[in-house]
Each structure stands twice: as C-alpha cells, then as structure tokens.
C-alpha cells in the first residue's frame, strides 16, 4: 500500500483535508480544506446562476449544491436540478424563476460527495444580487434647438432600477456620466450641432427594491449629430439594436415578475 498522509506544517497552518493513519477508513477526521465560495446572481429576476471555481479543488470533484430559504414557507432543502459544468466538472447551479424568492434569506450549501462532512453554507440576500438586462430601444428626440432627450426601456420593473447615462462627442477623450433615477429618461440641455454625440445607458437594481452593486451591461450605443441631425433638424429617433436573449440562455420560456408581486414581496 502506497497511500498518502496529509499533514499541517507550522503553527499557522490548518490540518489538511483528511489525515490518514493506520486507523480504519471510517475514522478519518473531518476535512478542513475550504470549499470554494459560491457566487450567485439573479438575472433580471428570470433565472439565477450560483457558480463556484471548480479549479480550486486539488482533485477533480463534482461538488453538489443544496439550497433552501431560511425562516419561510420555502425552508425545505432542495437539490440542484440543473447543474452548470466547466470541463465536465460541476461549477454551478441554475435556478429558474419559480425557485427564486427575492425577499427571503437564501441559504446555499456546497458539499463534497467524496467527503460528505466537508460542506460549507452561505446565506445570501437575493434582492442585492439582481442584475438587469441592458437597457433597450434607446431613442433620441430634440426638445428644442439645443436640447436633446434620451429615452430607453428596460425589460423589468422600471421603478426598481436606477440608471447611469454616459455620453461624449467625437472630440472628447472620456465619457461624461449622469445618474438617473427610475424615470429612465435623460435630458441634455446644451447640444453643439457641429458635433456627433454618442450615448449609452446601464441600469442597476437599486435602491427602491434592493441594494445591488452590479450594473447591467451597457446598452448598444446611440448616436446623434453631424450629417444625420442636419437631415431632420426637428426630430431624430434611432432605435438601438435589441439584444436578443435566447430561450436556452433563459432556461426556457420566462415571465417577468409583476409590479404588484414585487411590491407585495418587498413590503413583507
């Protein structure tokens, strides 16, 4: 037998995942090798991906994920039913809309099936982990000789989102930024008709319905000025190319959460 021993080395080091001695195998001590951290993001309240870095395991390990909601009617432990894989090893779990309860404490547990006592549990507030889709259908219209208004749509409850508009001219080296509240419109009071402007927008689930830190992707940019603005000096609208999300990406047909539902959950 040429098996292996795992030992700590120095006072500041932990004992390793298990310590083999001449004792029978059922006497292995509990592992202290930490499991990778699970990161969860709720995409537009349509589905949620909880992922971990499977490469951090010292040997290939199909870690398993269980979840439940703390102190709620949904406190029954659930097994992951849709694993995500990285090179044939589990590296995440996808939960569908019906399994997502934004305003209950989400508990996620990762476990090593080879060493079942090696497990780690995390508690997450899902309302702080929502990432909306990028804003769509950007349109520009001229309110007056020098004033432009930018409008956009979100495939989500607009009142839950804040926005960040960036714009610049072809002469600018950097973007100018402007925060916008849930109203999803932005006015630029002074426009130079000789310059070409580019606008883009991103959105965040904050602060009315959650406290998410992550922004959406940027919208497709929309342009104003130079030749195109002279062709129609009074009205100009350009729809940004819509970002299509395939059914496969969404994990099947989805329904957006209703505004009433969200208010109901939020105030509970």
């Amino acid at each position: 037998l040429n098996t292996t021993i795992l030992t700590p080395n120095g006072n500041e080091d932990a004992t390793t995942d298990f310590f083999l001695t001449s004792m029978p195998t059922d006497s292995l001590s509990v592992s202290t090798l930490p499991l990778p951290e699970v990161q969860c993001f709720v995409f537009n309240v349509e589905y949620m991906n909880c992922t971990w870095n499977s490469s951090s395991e010292p040997q290939p390990t199909n870690l398993t994920l269980h979840y439940w909601y703390k102190n709620s009617d949904n406190d029954k432990v659930q097994k992951c039913s849709h694993y995500l894989f990285s090179e044939e090893i589990t590296s995440g779990c996808q939960l569908q809309k019906k399994e997502i309860h934004l305003y209950q404490t989400f508990v996620v547990q990762l476990q090593d099936p080879r060493e079942p006592r090696r497990q780690a549990t995390q508690m997450l507030k899902l309302q702080n982990l929502v990432i909306p889709w990028a804003p769509e259908n950007l349109t520009l219209r001229k309110l007056s000789e020098s004033q432009l208004e930018l409008n956009w749509n979100n495939r989500f409850l607009n009142h839950c989102l804040e926005h960040l508009v960036q714009y610049r001219t072809d002469w600018d080296h950097s973007w100018t930024e402007q925060s916008v509240d849930y109203r999803h419109k932005f006015s630029l009071p002074s426009v130079d008709g000789q310059k070409r402007y580019t606008f883009r927008v991103r959105s965040r689930f904050n602060p009315l319905c959650g406290s998410a830190q992550h922004w959406s992707e940027w919208s497709h940019p929309i342009h104003w000025g130079s030749n195109s603005s002279k062709e129609n000096p009074f009205l100009f609208a350009l729809e940004a190319e819509q970002k299509l999300i395939s059914e496969e990406d969404l994990g099947g047909e989805q329904k957006l959460i209703s505004e009433e539902d969200l208010h109901h959950h939020h105030h509970h």
């Epitope: 292996t4 080091d13 290939p60």
Partner: antibody, heavy 121, light 108 residues
C-alpha cells in the same frame, strides 16, 4: 509563460538532508487554483510523486507514504518559491528530482529542469 | 491508490509509422488521464491532458482517447524527435498522483 527553476546541491551524504528549491515565475505559489509538487525519477521506481503544497485560504500539504516522516515541503511567498527537504537520505533516494505545477485539468503542465541527486559519502 | 499500467514497456518503430501506447487504470478514472513525453536529460513534457485534449504547442500527430479504465496515446506518423519515453498519469483521485511505469519508444 510559467517557468520553474530548480536549485540545490546534487550530492548529499547518507543520513543527511536533501534540500532543493523551486523558484516560480509567471504564477504565484499562493495561487488558489494551482498546486506545487515534487516528483522524482529513478531507474528502479520510475516517476514517483513525493508530495505537494497548495494554498486555499491556508496552506495544505500532501505527502506520499513512501517518504512518510522524512519529507517537508515549504512554500515561501516572499520569494515566490517552494522547497523540498528530505531527511535521513539513503542511496535509495538517489534520483532526478523535479518540481512541477498542477494546472489545467489537474495535469502537471509545467516542470522544473530537474536536479540529479547522488547520495554518497 | 490507483495503479497505472502501461503497455508495452518498450517498442521499436520507424519514422512514419503509426504508434499506439496503452494505459490501464486499476479503477475508473473518468477522463482524468494525462500523457507526458520525456527525453534523456530533460523534464517530462505534457502532451495530452484530460485523456484527449492536446496541450498547446504539441503537434497534432499526437492524440489521446479513452475513458474509464482504458486509454490510448497515438502518434499518427512518427517523426525523429518523437523517440522518447512516454508516461501516463492519473489525476482523478489524488493524493497520491500516480504514473504508469513508462513506455520507451526506440528507433527500429
């Protein structure tokens, strides 16, 4: 590009300690996805894994039972290197010693150049 | 521990030949099998990882196949620089990392 550069004496007296060092460039000894191994090659045993260290919020050490009680692997974050200490050597420990990184898909993707160690008085 | 057994232990072949080396694991290791080439005085070099994935920079005449317990390394058309010793290694259940005993490929 990851490179592993070995250093240490090629001649060790019986009963003394073999000490080798592996300096890492292009990666970090405290990477949370790599492991750092010592392996030796001898005509009698072929390629033989001796042990490894890896960092996952703290340091971990795995050692083969074939060198049980004689081996220590030490990482040194300040110099970005790791070392092998094998004490009470005998002529059986004469071999070419390699350091190697466990990387993509748990393969040994980068190796040091090797150090021929002779055990003789 | 998982034992790895290579066959043959040595073989002679000519430039241009198609060569196959096999490796058998004592228990299923899924696809966690790696192949290395070692030339005299040099360190082993990773050729194939995860049974069939070609390591960057390795010529496409090298290929790997197999899953479970039986694996194969194939060199489709031997080149002069391919004469070396080849090792298989399992990474499915570690520690310990275990290697095959090696296959020495010589010029006929």
């Amino acid at each position: 590009q990851v490179q592993l550069q070995q250093s240490g004496p090629g001649l060790v007296k019986p009963s003394q300690t073999l000490s080798l060092t592996c300096a890492i460039s292009g990666d970090s000894v405290s990477s949370n996805i790599a492991a750092w191994n010592w392996i030796r090659l001898s005509p009698s045993r072929g390629l033989e894994w001796l042990g490894r260290t890896f960092f996952r919020s703290t340091w971990f050490y795995d050692y083969s039972l074939s060198v049980k009680g004689r081996i220590t692997i030490n990482p040194d974050t300040s110099k970005n290197q790791f070392s092998l200490h094998l004490n009470s050597v005998t002529p059986e420990d004469a071999a070419v010693y390699y350091c190697a990184r466990t990387g993509r898909r748990w393969s040994l993707d980068y190796w040091g150049q090797g150090t021929l160690v002779t055990v003789s008085s | 521990d998982i034992q790895m057994t290579q066959s043959p232990s040595s073989l002679s072949a000519s430039v241009g030949d198609r060569v196959t080396i096999t490796c058998r694991a004592s228990q299923s290791i899924s696809s966690y099998l790696n192949w290395y080439q070692q030339k005299p005085g040099k360190a082993p070099k990773l050729l194939i990882y995860a049974a069939s994935s070609l390591q960057s920079g390795v010529p496409s005449r090298f290929s790997g196949s197999g899953s479970g317990t039986d694996f194969t390394l194939t060199i489709s058309s031997l080149q002069p620089e391919d004469f070396a010793t080849y090792y298989c290694q399992q990474s499915y259940s570690t520690p310990p990392i275990t290697f095959g005993q090696g296959t020495r490929l010589e010029i006929k």
